[in-house]
């Protein structure tokens, strides 16, 4: 039985070192093991972490937990059936669901957001589903870097 | 030792402002990953139709170069055709450039299943006439 030869000594699917792959391009230069799509870079984890751990892991890569612009943003992985932590949390101070950059959640993004438990964090499936779950649960996560 | 040429810059990420809304080396709406462009199809096609569809996009039907790429693609999509086939169960599995494909393909003993599909972290044989999602790849 043959198995594939590993091409990299980096452990699979942890945000890796800063590597420029498209050296001659004036466009997306995403780190190794990150996905470039529509001028954003995404790290799609295969490891499960709590929401806080996920947030810190993204921050350590100068990125943030996914902030969605619209439900089509992850169109390239809409067939995925995993749920991923995203950068949405409830602010008691503002009595609103806020993204990590402080902007408010659009009511059109998740029509059911009013039923979310405000003590929970939000796990998102790229098909458009969102669930509120205990922030101590371990889920995969998605980091995002905006290039423009 | 890694076969990748790695350039480290600990102080800042290697990013540049972009002029276009898509990546220069890849067609719009394709994704980049590890120095390749991928078209992530939503449409289901037979193996041969998928082959032609990728050719028309100046690319190849998905090829899998290593375990890590297989894991990544399995996260993106549960199953898709790959560019590996055989003429019959008595013939070897070959890639699109005619090279023998050495990696394990499940259910190879079934004579009706002569095209290969990636299915959640493993490679399987399937009926070439089945309608399955396809992805295309273009190495940068």
């Amino acid at each position: 039985k043959n198995s594939f030869t590993k091409l990299s000594i980096e452990p699979a699917f942890t945000p890796g070192p800063n590597i420029e792959l498209q050296k001659d391009s004036d466009c997306c230069s995403c780190q190794e093991k990150w996905v470039g799509y529509r001028c954003n870079c995404y790290f799609i984890s295969s490891e499960q972490k709590t929401w806080n751990e996920s947030r810190h892991l993204c921050a350590s890569q100068k990125s943030s937990l996914l902030q969605l612009q619209n439900t089509d943003e992850l169109d390239f992985m809409s067939s995925s059936q995993q749920f991923y932590w995203i950068g949405l949390s409830y602010s008691e101070e503002h009595t609103a669901w806020l993204w990590e950059n402080g902007s408010a959640l659009s009511q059109y993004l998740f029509p059911s957001f009013e039923t979310f438990n405000t003590k929970n964090c939000i796990a998102y499936n790229p098909n458009g589903n969102a669930l509120d779950e205990s922030c101590e649960d371990k889920n995969r996560y998605i980091c995002k870097q905006q290039l423009i | 030792p890694s076969t990748l040429i790695q350039r480290h810059n600990n102080s800042s990420l290697n990013t540049r402002t972009q002029k276009a809304r898509h990546c220069g080396h890849c067609p719009e709406e394709w994704i980049t990953y590890s120095n390749s462009c991928y078209y992530i199809g939503k449409e289901r096609r037979t193996w041969e139709e998928s082959l032609l569809a990728c050719t028309s996009k100046n690319s190849s039907l998905l090829s899998i170069d290593n375990e890590e790429e297989m894991k990544f693609l399995s996260i993106i999509s549960p199953s898709s055709w790959i560019g590996v086939f055989r003429n019959s169960s008595h013939h070897p599995w070959v890639t699109m450039n005619g090279l023998a494909f050495k990696h394990e393909i499940k259910d190879s003993d079934n004579a009706e299943l002569n095209c290969a599909v990636l299915q959640v972290n493993r490679l399987k044989s399937a009926q070439c006439g089945s309608s399955i999602i396809y992805h295309c790849k273009h190495k940068l």
Epitope: S79, Q81, S134, K138 | -
Partner: antibody, heavy 120, light 107 residues
Framework: EVQLVESGGGLVQPGGSLRLSCAAS????????MNWVRQAPGKGLEWVST????????YYADSVKGRFTISRDNSKDTLYLQMNSLRAEDTAVYYC?????????????WGQGTLVTVSS | DIQMTQSPSSVSASVGDRVTITCRAS??????LAWYQQKSGKAPKLLIY???SLQIGVPSRFSGSGSGTDFTLTISSLQPEDFATYYC?????????FGQGTKLEIK
């Protein structure tokens, strides 16, 4: 080899309580959501409850909400179902089932089941 | 809640036959569908997940297809051990729901 072994079933009167257990082995229990699914005699399958990997999030079928409580002890690799205010219609074989690694809504391994009979 | 309707409720077939069972969801569930096989007095066994992905260890004569609301389980050439009851299940949203089952009997 993945194994799930249920216990705690038996005969109980309407209004009574019962606690089911499911001992897991052969996989990293704390990494997976777990489920209870039941099957009334001669009937089809009915999902009962799901608990997340850490135990922090739980989901219930409307038919058992407020009466049943799912929980887990990751240090003991054990899943529980506390059943209160039991009714005749809760009579069934109760299966514990592990969530699939690809997506948590699929059940890739099942226990052999434990029979709960609610009757006076 | 999403209702799952299987047809037929029972089917008689012979060894070597090709058998198709269908499952319809009351609303679109993309590809969030599983098929299970259950033999009398035994626990269910996962055959197919994500509508068409074959669970490891399941023979390739079993295949699944469909997306949205209409799904199919096909057994290409029936074997004696395939006579059982088959259930579909949606995993798109809570509460997870099963079809009523299709009993596959020997003709």
């Amino acid at each position: 080899e993945v194994q799930l072994v249920e216990s705690g079933g038996g005969l109980v009167q309407p209004g009574g309580s019962l606690r089911l257990s499911c001992a897991a082995s052969g996989f990293t229990f704390s990494s997976y959501a777990m489920n209870w699914v039941r099957q009334a005699p001669g009937k089809g399958l009915e999902w009962v409850s799901t608990i997340s990997n850490s135990g922090g999030t739980t989901y219930y079928a409307d038919s058992v909400k407020g009466r049943f409580t799912i929980s887990r002890d990751n240090s003991k690799d054990t899943l529980y179902l506390q059943m209160n205010s039991l009714r005749a219609e809760d009579t069934a074989v109760y299966y514990c089932a592990k969530a699939h690694y690809y997506a948590r809504g699929y059940f890739d391994y099942w226990g052999q089941g434990t029979l709960v009979t609610v009757s006076s | 809640d999403i209702q799952m309707t299987q047809s037929p409720s029972s089917v008689s077939a012979s060894v070597g036959d090709r058998v198709t069972i269908t499952c319809r969801a009351s609303q679109g569930i993309s590809s969030w569908l599983a098929w299970y096989q259950q033999k009398s007095g035994k626990a269910p066994k996962l055959l197919i997940y994500a509508a068409s992905s074959l669970q490891i260890g399941v023979p390739s004569r079993f295949s699944g297809s469909g997306s949205g609301t209409d799904f199919t389980l096909t057994i290409s050439s029936l074997q004696p051990e395939d006579f059982a009851t088959y259930y579909c299940q949606q995993a798109n949203s809570f509460p997870y729901t099963f079809g009523q089952g299709t009993k596959l009997e020997i003709k």
